[in-house]
Interface confidence: low
C-alpha cells in the first residue's frame, strides 16, 4: 500500500536502532572514504527528520522518496569533489539517475587500510564506554570495505559482535575469550560478503530472471516438500529483497526480508518441517537462521524426472505454451531431487535442457531428439564431481597453506598478467575451500565447493574488470555466471605470456619478516612464489617445491639467528643465486 511518507513508514517498521544502523550502512557503502564521525552526523540528521515525519506525515519534504532524501544528504557533504572526484558529478543528476550513478561508483577494492582489531583491553574499554558508538564504528568499517554487504545480515553480525564483547569483556582473560570468537564471526562475515557480491553481480549483469532461477534452485533443494507455487512465491520475494539491497534500498530490503521471514514462519506447514527452531528466534537471528536452514527430508516417493520432462508426449507443447514456467518446473523438480548438486551445476543442467528443447522441438521427431537429454547431463555432472575429488585429495595431502600454494601456482600460470596481490588474495581464498568444504559429508561437498569457488571467482572478475590485463580472465569473466568456474578450471598455462625478468629485490627479505604474524609471513612467502612463477611459468612442481623449501629454511635459520640482520644480508643473496640455479 502507498504511504504518505516513505521515511516515516520505514522508521516505524524497523524501529530506531535498525533504522539508524541501516542508514549508516547505506551512507558508508556509497561514500567509502568519509570518516565515521561525518557519517554519524548525517545519520543523526536523517533520524531526527524521520521522527518529525512520524509525528506529522504531512510535514515539509516527508513525502520525498528515500533516494531523494539520502542523495540530497550525500550531495550536501562539503569537499565532495576533492575527496571523491567524478562521483561528485552524480549530484548534477536527478533521481533515479543520481542513485544509479552512486551505485556505479561503488568501489569493490577501496584503498583503505585493513580493518585492524584493537587489542582486547582497549576494545573492552571503548565498548563499555559507549556500546552504540562502538557498534557504529564496526558497521561503518565493514560497510565501507564491502559496499555490497547484505545490510540486514551486517546488522546480524554486529549483534553477534555485541554479544561476544558483552560476554568476553566480563572475563578475566579477555584475549583468549575474544580472539577465537571474533575470528569466527570475521570468517563468516567475509564469506557472506563474497556470496552477496555474487548475487548482486548476477542481478546487475543478467537481471532479475537469472537471480530468480538461482533462487528457485536453491529453495527447491532446501524445501523439497514445498510445491512449485510456494517455491515460486518465495523466489519472487527473495529476488525483490536482494534487488533492493543490491540497489542500495537498504531500508526497504531489511523491511521486506523481515516480512519474508514472518511469512515463512507462518507457513511452515507448506514450506518445511525444519523451520521451527529458526522461527523461535528474534528477528535478525531468525532471518539469518532461515537463510542457512538445513535441507528438509526429501519425499521418499518422487517419480523419476524423465516422466514429465522426457517421456511425456506433451513436452514440446508444454514448453511452447509457457517456456519460463515449464523450465521453472524442470529446475524445481531436478533441484529438489539433488541437494547434493551445486546451484551452479543445476543451472547448467537447466540451460542444457532448454537448449535441447529449443533444438529438438523444431525437428520432425522431437521425442527421438530429446530422448537422450538426461544421459547428456552426465559429463556436466562428472566434471565438478572430479574437481571436488581431485582438490579435496590435494587439500588432505597438503593442508590449507600447501593447498593455497598449489592453487597459487596453478592460477599464476593461467593468468600471469594479473597483479601479484590479486593472485595471492584469490589463491588464499580459493584455498580456504578445503577447510570449509572438504571436511563435510560426501553429499555436501560438491554444493559447498562449487558455489564457494564461484563466489570467489566473481571477486576475481570484479577486480580484473577495473584493470583488464589477461585475455584468459576476460574470456572466463565475460560468459555467463554459471560457466565461469568450469571456464577457469579449464584454463591452462598462458602461452602468450612473456616471462618477467628475474629481479633480485623481489626475493630480498629483511629481519622484520620474523616478527610478522603467521598470516602476514605466509602472504610474503606466497608473494615470492607468485613472482617465481611469473619468472618461470613452466617451472615444474618439483622445482618450485625445492625453491620454496629452501626459502622456508632460510627464513627459519635467519629468524633464529642471534644477529638476524647480518644473516639476512649475507644469506639472502646466496638464496637468490640458488633460486636462479634451481629454476634454470
Amino acid at each position: 500500500e502507498a504511504h504518505k511518507s516513505e521515511i516515516a513508514h520505514r522508521y516505524n517498521d524497523l524501529g530506531e536502532q535498525h533504522f539508524k544502523g541501516l542508514v549508516l550502512i547505506a551512507f558508508s557503502q556509497y561514500l567509502q572514504k568519509c570518516s565515521y564521525d561525518e557519517h554519524a552526523k548525517l545519520v543523526q540528521e536523517v533520524t531526527d527528520f524521520a521522527k518529525t515525519c512520524v509525528a506529522d506525515e504531512s510535514a515539509a519534504n516527508c513525502d520525498k522518496s528515500l533516494h531523494t532524501l539520502f542523495g540530497d544528504k550525500l550531495c550536501a557533504i562539503p569537499n565532495l569533489r576533492e575527496n571523491y572526484g567524478e562521483l561528485a558529478d552524480c549530484c548534477t543528476k536527478q533521481e533515479p539517475e543520481r542513485n544509479e550513478c552512486f551505485l556505479q561508483h561503488k568501489d569493490d577494492n577501496p584503498s583503505l587500510p585493513p580493518f585492524e582489531r584493537p587489542e582486547a583491553e582497549a576494545m573492552c574499554t571503548s565498548f563499555k564506554e559507549n556500546p552504540t558508538t562502538f557498534m557504529g564504528h564496526y558497521l561503518h568499517e565493514v560497510a565501507r570495505r564491502h559496499p555490497y554487504f547484505y545490510a540486514p545480515e551486517l546488522l546480524y553480525y554486529a549483534e553477534q559482535y555485541n554479544e561476544i564483547l558483552t560476554q568476553c569483556c566480563a572475563e578475566a582473560d579477555k584475549e583468549s575469550c575474544l580472539t577465537p570468537k571474533l575470528d569466527g564471526v570475521k570468517e563468516k562475515a567475509l564469506v557472506s560478503s563474497v556470496r552477496q557480491r555474487m548475487k548482486c553481480s548476477s542481478m546487475q549483469k543478467f537481471g532479475e530472471r537469472a537471480f530468480k532461477a538461482w533462487a528457485v534452485a536453491r529453495l527447491s533443494q532446501t524445501f523439497p516438500n514445498a510445491d512449485f507455487a510456494e517455491i515460486t512465491k518465495l523466489a519472487t520475494d527473495l529476488t525483490k529483497v536482494n534487488k533492493e539491497c543490491c540497489h542500495g534500498d537498504l531500508l526497504e530490503c531489511a523491511d521486506d526480508r523481515a516480512e519474508l521471514a514472518k511469512y515463512m514462519c507462518e507457513n511452515q506447514a507448506t514450506i518445511s518441517s525444519k523451520l521451527q527452531t529458526c522461527c523461535d528466534k528474534p528477528l535478525l537471528k531468525k532471518a539469518h537462521c532461515l537463510s542457512e536452514v538445513e535441507h528438509d527430508t526429501m519425499p521418499a516417493d518422487l517419480p523419476a524426472i524423465a516422466a514429465d520432462f522426457v517421456e511425456d508426449q506433451e513436452v514440446c507443447k508444454n514448453y511452447a505454451e509457457a517456456k519460463d514456467v515449464f523450465l521453472g518446473t524442470f529446475l524445481y523438480e531436478y533441484s529438489r531431487r539433488h541437494p547434493d548438486y551445486s546451484v551452479s551445476l543445476l543451472l547448467r543442467l537447466a540451460k542444457k535442457y532448454e537448449a535441447t528443447l529449443e533444438k529438438c522441438c523444431a525437428e520432425a521427431n522431437p521425442p527421438a531428439c530429446y530422448g537422450t537429454v538426461l544421459a547428456e547431463f552426465q559429463p556436466l555432472v562428472e566434471e565438478p564431481k572430479n574437481l571436488v575429488k581431485t582438490n579435496c585429495d590435494l587439500y588432505e595431502k597438503l593442508g590449507e597453506y600447501g593447498f593455497q600454494n598449489a592453487i597459487l601456482v596453478r592460477y599464476t600460470q593461467k593468468a600471469p598478467q594479473v597483479s601479484t596481490p590479486t593472485l595471492v588474495e584469490a589463491a588464499r581464498n580459493l584455498g580456504r575451500v578445503g577447510t570449509k568444504c572438504c571436511t563435510l559429508p560426501e553429499d555436501q561437498r560438491l554444493p559447498c565447493v562449487e558455489d564457494y569457488l564461484s563466489a570467489i571467482l566473481n571477486r576475481v572478475c570484479l577486480l580484473h574488470e577495473k584493470t583488464p590485463v589477461s585475455e584468459h580472465v576476460t574470456k572466463c569473466c565475460s560468459g555467463s555466471l554459471v560457466e565461469r568456474r568450469p571456464c577457469f578450471s579449464a584454463l591452462t598455462v598462458d602461452e602468450t605470456y612473456v616471462p618477467k625478468e628475474f629481479k633480485a629485490e623481489t626475493f630480498t627479505f629483511h629481519s622484520d619478516i620474523c616478527t610478522l604474524p603467521e598470516k602476514e609471513k605466509q602472504i610474503k612467502k606466497q608473494t615470492a612464489l607468485a613472482e617465481l612463477v611469473k619468472h618461470k611459468p613452466k617451472a615444474t612442481a618439483e622445482q618450485l617445491k625445492t625453491v620454496m623449501d629452501d626459502f622456508a629454511q632460510f627464513l627459519d635459520t635467519c629468524c633464529k639467528a642471534a644477529d638476524k640482520d647480518t644473516c639476512f644480508s649475507t644469506e639472502g643473496p646466496n638464496l637468490v643465486t640458488r633460486c636462479k640455479d634451481a629454476l634454470a
Epitope: 510456494e230 511452515q268 506447514a269 517419480p303
Partner: nanobody
Framework: QVQLAESGGGLVQPGGSLRLTCTAS????????MSWVRQAPGEGLEWVSA????????RYADSVKGRFTISRDNAKKMLYLEMNSLKSEDTAVYYC???????ASQGTQVTVSS
Amino acid sequence: QVQLAESGGGLVQPGGSLRLTCTASGFTFGSFGMSWVRQAPGEGLEWVSAISADSSDKRYADSVKGRFTISRDNAKKMLYLEMNSLKSEDTAVYYCVIGRGSPASQGTQVTVSS
C-alpha cells in the same frame, strides 16, 4: 492429472460438528504440505489450516484454533478436517489445496445455522 475431491460438508446447528475429507490422486500426495481454505458468501478466500507432508507440523488460523483439527493419511491419500463447536461464521465452501495453492476443485459446502 492432479485431482482433489472434498466431501463431508452439510447443514449443521451452531455448536455441532462435521468431518471433512479430501481424496487426492494424480500426484505424490505424501510429498506435499496440504491446506484447507474456505470462501464465505461474498468474501475472499480465507486460509483455515495447513499440515506438513509428514504431519509433524500443523497450523491453524486464529479464528479456528482449538475448534478445528487437521490430519492426513498418506497411505490412503486422504486429508481431513475435524470441525467442532461450529459457529455461523464458519459457513463457507471449504476447499483442500496443495501447499498454499489456489482451489482447483468443487469444494464442499458447510452451512452452520439454527
